[in-house]
């Protein structure tokens, strides 16, 4: 398939409201940029089950963002 148009967010739609903590391998946060004007929370699942976008407005996402920011700053 061809490349996607530039300026596109990585996630489609609002994202899932929650992911089982036991299924999470890692969490990545993409902050607003020229390509996407919103924060995106991407969850990598264990056992090669791919990735899911977490709704950044969900309680779980807010906790993850807080945790990551605490770790980084």
């Amino acid at each position: 398939f061809p490349m996607f148009k530039r300026g596109r967010c990585l996630c489609i739609g609002p994202g899932v409201k929650a992911v089982k903590v036991a299924d999470i391998e890692k969490a990545s946060i993409m902050y607003p940029s020229n390509n996407c004007d919103k924060i995106e929370v991407i969850i990598t699942l264990k056992e090669n089950k791919g990735q899911r976008c977490l709704n950044p407005k969900s309680k779980q996402a807010r906790l993850i963002i807080k945790k990551v920011e605490r770790k980084n700053f």
């Epitope: 398939f1 996607f4 596109r8 967010c9 990585l10 996630c11 489609i12 739609g13 609002p14 994202g15 899932v16 409201k17 992911v19 991407i42 969850i43 089950k49 791919g50 990735q51 899911r52 976008c53 977490l54 709704n55």
Partner: nanobody
């Protein structure tokens, strides 16, 4: 109970048109991306088009670009696939699927979709 029900398939001559519908129930429509896939006899299931219910973002496979149009009516929880200038190679069973939390990089990965319809047959004769 979650349900995706496709309709609108049939037999059409090459160059003709069909409109497929995918009626969804049992989940929050706005949270999901709805994809259309197709499977021809002896071939793997392939992605055709998808739409994000929340922001109406769309994407098409190269093979259908300019011929197929996907749209959604959120009030009816229904996604439509308007298929014009049909070719014999479009012959397949067409399925709709719903996935939440999808990434643009994995929209054609069938395992990422949570719910599937039963399919509707589209046959294009030459």
């Amino acid at each position: 109970e979650v349900q995706l029900v496709e309709s609108g398939g049939g037999l059409v001559q090459a160059g003709g048109s069909l409109r497929l519908s995918c009626a969804a129930s049992g989940f929050t429509f706005d949270d999901y991306a709805i994809g259309w896939f197709r499977q021809a006899p002896g071939k793997e299931r392939e992605g055709v088009s998808w739409i994000s219910s929340s922001d109406k973002d769309t994407y098409y496979a190269d093979s259908v670009k300019g011929r197929f149009t996907i749209s959604s009516d959120n009030a009816k929880n229904t996604v439509y696939l308007q298929m014009n200038s049909l070719k014999p190679e479009d012959t397949a069973v067409y399925y709709c699927a719903a996935g939440a939390g999808l990434l643009i990089a994995t929209i054609w990965t069938t395992q990422m979709y949570d719910y599937w319809g039963q399919g509707t047959q589209v046959t294009v004769s030459s």
